[in-house]
Interface confidence: low
């Protein structure tokens, strides 16, 4: 089951995953004028064991004389979802493999890949938010959203972030370095929900292939 919608949209902010939980899928998309090779993989899949995670399959694109007919791949085709894009982002090597077991790094770019990446997130995935050019965060602490399963349904937690134009606010007087622990941050949740620490979120493993689409663009 797909996570409900995409991660929340915050005005004047962009978001990305720093690492991808096992079970995450990445579509093999090619740029215009290219297509996936015949018998080539439709997607890459983050798989692994307790000690090592990596992406299965390789995406390969080949020149195409006809219009690119690569289609969006979803784990469950009957549940198509709207594709959304974030700020242009360059290829990243996000998180130390050892620091987040059960997670894959950002896959390196492949030749002639499309300008946007379409991910299918699994429950437990965390994405981080950051204000874009010309805006500053009123809340100086961590800003993240986690895909959770609650009462049989999936949802993204609401990131605690407001981005305001730099002209609309003065410098932050007496800014203090926030604590590493984001405990106690409020969430707009119903009373039936159980609070979960970041550690629990990062270490819980999704038992099923519950995913959400997330698209990032490349420069």
């Amino acid at each position: 089951e797909l996570c409900d919608d995409d991660p929340p949209e915050i005005p004047h902010a962009t978001f990305k995953a720093m690492a991808y939980k096992e079970g995450t899928m990445l579509n093999c998309e090619c740029k215009r004028g290219f297509r996936r090779i015949k018998s080539g993989s439709l997607y890459m899949l983050c798989t692994g064991n307790s000690s090592h995670s990596s992406w299965d399959n390789q995406c390969q694109c080949t020149s195409s004389a006809t219009r690119n007919t690569t289609k969006q791949v979803t784990p469950q085709p009957e549940e198509q979802k709207e594709r959304k894009t974030t700020e242009m982002q360059s290829p990243m090597q996000p998180v130390d493999q050892a620091s987040l077991p059960g997670h894959c790094r950002e896959p390196p770019p492949w030749e002639n890949e499309a300008t946007e990446r379409i991910y299918h997130f699994v429950v437990g995935q965390m994405v981080y938010y950051q204000c874009v050019q010309g805006y500053r965060a009123l809340h100086r602490g961590p800003a993240e959203s986690v895909c959770k399963m609650t009462h049989g349904k999936t949802r993204w937690t609401q990131p605690q972030l407001i981005c305001t134009g730099e002209m609309e606010t003065s410098q932050f007087p007496g800014e203090e370095k926030p604590q590493a622990s984001p405990e106690g941050r409020p969430e707009s949740e119903t009373s039936c929900l159980v609070t979960t620490t970041d550690f629990q979120i990062q270490t819980e493993m999704a038992a099923t292939m519950e995913t959400s689409i997330f698209t990032t663009e490349y420069q």
């Epitope: 974030t86 950051q130 961590p142 590493a180 420069q219």
Partner: nanobody, 127 residues
Amino acid sequence: EVQLVESGGGLVQAGGSLRLSCAASGRAFSMYNMGWFRQAPGKEREFVAATGWSGANTPYADSVKGRFTISRDNTQNTVYLQMNSLKPEDTATYYCAADSIRLRSDVTRIPLEYDYWGQGTQVTVSS
């Protein structure tokens, strides 16, 4: 822990250009906002420019706007500072710094909020 090593400094005439590089090793580079600061003899360390992990947020000090450009290459774990139209008052030791985005949701200009620092590279602009 992140280790930062700056390079590219040197002696240049006013109006000239330099490109500083900061190579990062250790923890994942893209998990950090990156900043450039400078310190002239007898003066406090001051903010020059910074970039968020996406490159979408790049504040500059007013004194360098339009002359300096910060960029990052997350595949090479490197952040750059392209400095054009250099002035004698740009003479200083330039430092690269990293700030964990797990702690922050925007790009800060405050030196104390950066977690890791390089040793610096000297830039001298002669008139």
